[in-house]
Amino acid sequence: ESALITQQDLAPQQRAAPQQKRSSPSEGLCPPGHHISEDGRDCISCKYGQDYSTHWNDLLFCLRCTRCDSGEVELSPCTTTRNTVCQCEEGTFREEDSPEMCRKCRTGCPRGMVKVGDCTPWSDIECVHKESGTKHSGEVPAVEETVTSSPGTPASPCSLSG
């Protein structure tokens, strides 16, 4: 069991680090950054950089921190109260229907289409027909048919697939 030391057990010069603190549940729940003990009487801190909890809870265990995959960059590290924030590298994006991996953005639009949206970490470039303005979701065009684009940089939290 992690962090079973109470503050009172220690001399002033040996005070436990924040991740070792233990407290009592409030109305049966423990605060963010903690999980409940086996007997339900104590709140035990999550381990910084290893696991976390984001809400008041009665969880037996803190949740494992996400580890950013290769092809992702870490925007913010895991704390005891917040999961790691990962983002696809420049030029790649994560689709909602395949959140476990970053895919390469298309480099441009097919002939007869114009780019109306940049590559972002969560979306491919967006192309529309010049005349009708309807969106295109076809295959990646040949190089001579492309209009190049530059990737965007906004951030998005990553999925829970360490």
Epitope: L59, L60, F61, L63, R64, G162
Partner: nanobody
Amino acid sequence: EVQLLESGGGLVQPGGSLRLSCAASGRAFSNYAMSWFRQAPGKGLEFVSAINWNGENRYYADSVKGRFTISRDNSKNTLYLQMNSLRAEDTAVYYCAAALSFRLGGEPYGDAYWGQGTLVTVSS
């Protein structure tokens, strides 16, 4: 998604031992807390034991404390339940489950994945 397959059940005499295994495939096993539940004939599902993602923290129901030991081997994607001093009342179908965590009463937190179960019969 995680697929779970239990094994190791069987017929054992009172006082005997069994070791159940739960083999996982699919997404990263080590991301999940794991647990064992059981369902005795004609009864509801009972939370037996649980273990956190790295095996450091464990939970046991009062009915099995001191007799059962839960463990996991993340390198083998396998969860175990060592059952000693078995009693007739331990007779049940044992299920393993994976979830991000489990609440104090045993309720899985987030999406839960379940095995098909393995039958343990304790009888002389």
